[in-house]
């Protein structure tokens, strides 16, 4: 039975040209995290494996930085970066947990962080 929950940074906004940290946290399970995949819609951004380190997809390599931790930093944001981002936790023996973050990139300087929320 999958007992874990993923806590994410929820709905967030950031300024065009700025950067943002996408973070998820898996809790309430003793399952071992084998790797975390970061995806945007149907595109792979990055993979983090505790032992093998990071893979950054080449189409994002100039604008994505690994970390902090299992999180991902998006840099030089554009309005085209607005959309859904997913952290996919591959765990043993539970299986896969997915968290969702919605990022809105704003033209103005008014960019506030949304509240945290949980996905079971």
């Amino acid at each position: 039975m999958m007992t874990g929950t993923i806590e994410t940074t929820g709905n967030i906004s950031a300024e065009k040209g700025g950067s943002i940290i996408l973070q998820c946290h898996l809790s309430s399970t003793t399952a071992q995290v084998t790797q975390v995949n970061w995806e945007q819609q149907d595109q792979l951004l990055a993979i983090c494996n505790a032992d093998l380190g990071w893979h950054i997809s080449p189409s994002f390599k100039d604008r994505v930085a690994p970390g902090p931790g299992l999180g991902l930093t998006l840099q030089s944001l554009t309005v085209n970066d607005t959309g859904e981002y997913f952290c996919i936790y591959h765990t043993y023996p539970d299986g896969t947990y997915t968290g969702r973050i919605f990022l809105e990139v704003l033209e103005s300087s008014v960019a506030e962080h949304g509240a945290r929320f949980q996905i079971p």
């Epitope: 790797q35 993979i47 032992d51 093998l52 893979h55 997809s57 690994p66």
Partner: antibody
Framework: EVQLQQSGPELVKPGASVKISCKTS????????MHWVKQSHGKSLEWIGG????????TYNQKFKGKATLTVDKSSSTAYMEFRSLTSEDSAVYYC????????????WGQGTTLTVSS | DIVMTQSHKFMSTSVGDRVSITCKAS??????VAWYQQKPGQSPKLLIY???YRYTGVPDRFTGSGSGTDFTFTISSVQAEDLALYYC?????????FGGGTKLEIK
């Protein structure tokens, strides 16, 4: 120039163990994970697992857990793979291969080590 | 485990021909796919990574395309030295897996 120099061919008896080495040069050994790949005669490639030379952390293909042990010697920039309880099914060519930086692709491979298990 | 299926074990072609090798993943692997070339008696060599990126020094007659479950490796004008085995490889999730290989034979 990046080089991965593997140890020579091995002929061993069933039930024995063998340790294959992969001596590297031309790059910062601890900054890139090292992997091992099996190629049975006339067959495809199988990923055995990888090791982070900096931390010693390993990730294995479940199929090879308990069969293969990956280690490194940082002082000599050498990676090792020990194979135990050998059977004829383990007869194959084994390659070490390093990953690209921040990408899960093998950019350099050793020349391969042929392992023959026979009584 | 993700199974990578290369439907053709052998492909026969002539120098100058265009040839395409296909690879199908048993589940969506996004673009986490590479293509390797292995010439007789040699170690594999990286040609294409992330489905469509040509590795440094690889001639531009080699191209890759696809995403999700269907991937294609193409040689636009086959040369005699392209006689080799070609493997697809996924790293979307461990254990990383390879296709069964396609042997390119020159007529």
């Amino acid at each position: 120039e990046v080089q991965l120099q593997q140890s020579g061919p091995e002929l061993v008896k069933p039930g024995a163990s063998v340790k294959i080495s992969c001596k590297t040069s031309g790059y910062a050994f601890t900054e890139y994970t090292m992997h091992w790949v099996k190629q049975s005669h006339g067959k495809s490639l199988e990923w055995i697992g990888g090791i982070n030379p900096n931390t010693g952390g390993t990730t294995y293909n479940q199929k090879f857990k308990g069969k293969a042990t990956l280690t490194v010697d940082k002082s000599s920039s050498t990676a090792y793979m020990e194979f135990r309880s050998l059977t004829s099914e383990d007869s194959a060519v084994y390659y070490c291969a390093k990953l690209l930086r921040l990408m899960y692709y093998f950019d350099y491979w050793g020349q391969g080590t042929t392992l023959t298990v026979s009584s | 485990d993700i199974v990578m299926t290369q439907s053709h074990k052998f492909m026969s072609t002539s120098v100058g021909d265009r040839v395409s090798i296909t690879c199908k993943a048993s589940q969506d692997v996004r673009t986490a796919v590479a293509w390797y070339q292995q010439k007789p008696g040699q170690s594999p060599k990286l040609l294409i990574y992330s489905a469509s990126y040509r590795y440094t020094g690889v001639p531009d007659r080699f191209t890759g395309s696809g995403s999700g479950t269907d991937f294609t490796f193409t040689i636009s004008s086959v040369q005699a030295e392209d006689l080799a085995l070609y493997y697809c490889h996924q790293h979307y999730i461990t254990p990383w897996t390879f296709g069964g290989g396609t042997k390119l034979e020159i007529k």
